[in-house]
Amino acid sequence: MMTGTIETTGNISAEKGGSIILQCHLSSTTAQVTQVNWEQQDQLLAICNADLGWHISPSFKDRVAPGPGLGLTLQSLTVNDTGEYFCIYHTYPDGTYTGRIFLEVLESSVAEHGARFQIP
């Protein structure tokens, strides 16, 4: 039976040109994490294998950095990076746990003034 839960950073925003850390945490299970995959829509960004370490997709090597921990750092953000990101924990014996993060990349001026989050 799968008893674990994934906590994520949830919905986050960041400034164009900046960087952001995507973080997930698996709890409430004694299952062994064998691999964590980070995905964006239909693309694999990076893999952290328990035995073999981090491996970044060649197409993202210049903009993605491993860590901290099992998290992932996205750099040089563009508006096109807005969207859903998934952390997929492959575990034994439980199977697969998936966490979702929504990232919105804002134009610098919007992010600076925080206009998007003002409550009328």
């Epitope: 064998t34 995959n37 693309q43 694999l44 370490g53």
Partner: antibody
């Protein structure tokens, strides 16, 4: 130029062990994985296992666990795959390959292992 | 283990015509699929990685597409030197399984 040069063909008796070497050159040995793949006559390619020569970390296909050992010698940029308790079904061509993000961009020339009594 | 099922098993195509090979994963593999060309007596050669990225030096008549569970390798205009067995492989999770292969021949 990236090259992976494997040891020569082997003929072994059932129950014996075989150790195949794979000497890498032309790149930083510890920056890439070394993967081992075999192909038995008329069969598909079969992944056996992998080593990270930098860390020494290994990962094996479940069916080979306890029978296969993959090692790497950083000083000579050589990886080794040892398969024990050989049986006739282990007759195959064994390849080492350089692993870049878990796909294989350079391959050795292959080593034929024949298991026969 | 993730099972990779290739179709067809063999394919005969006229020179200059299009060849299409399909590969289906038994579970989600995102874009974690590579394609290899294997000629008799030679080692396999990488053609495509991450489903659609052509490897260095591979002719542009080879292209890959797909994500999730369904993937395709296309040879847009078959040449005599393309006669080989083609394999898909998932590089999403260990063990890194291969498809059964598709033999491409000249019609």
């Amino acid at each position: 130029e990236v090259q992976l040069v494997q040891s020569g063909a082997e003929v072994k008796k059932p129950g014996a062990s075989v150790k195949v070497s794979c000497k890498a050159s032309g790149y930083a040995f510890t920056n890439y994985l070394i993967e081992w793949v075999r192909q038995a006559p008329g069969q598909r390619l079969e992944w056996m296992g992998v080593i990270n020569p930098g860390s020494g970390g290994t990962n094996y296909k479940e069916k080979f666990k306890g029978r296969v050992t993959i090692t790497a010698d950083k000083s000579s940029s050589t990886a080794y795959m040892e398969l024990s308790s050989l049986r006739s079904e282990d007759t195959a061509v064994y390849y080492c390959a350089r692993g870049e993000y878990f796909f294989f961009d350079y391959w050795g020339q292959g080593t034929t292992v024949t298991v026969s009594s | 283990d993730i099972v990779m099922t290739q179709s067809p098993d063999s394919l005969a195509v006229s020179l200059g015509e299009r060849a299409t090979i399909n590969c289906k994963a038994s579970q989600h593999v995102s874009d974690g699929v590579a394609w290899y060309q294997h000629k008799p007596g030679q080692s396999p050669k990488l053609l495509i990685y991450s489903a659609s990225y052509r490897y260095t030096g591979v002719p542009d008549r080879f292209s890959g597409s797909g994500s999730g569970t369904d993937f395709t390798l296309t040879i847009s205009s078959l040449q005599a030197e393309d006669v080989a067995v083609y394999y898909c492989q998932q590089h999403y999770n260990t063990p890194h399984t291969f498809g059964g292969g598709t033999k491409v021949e000249i019609k």
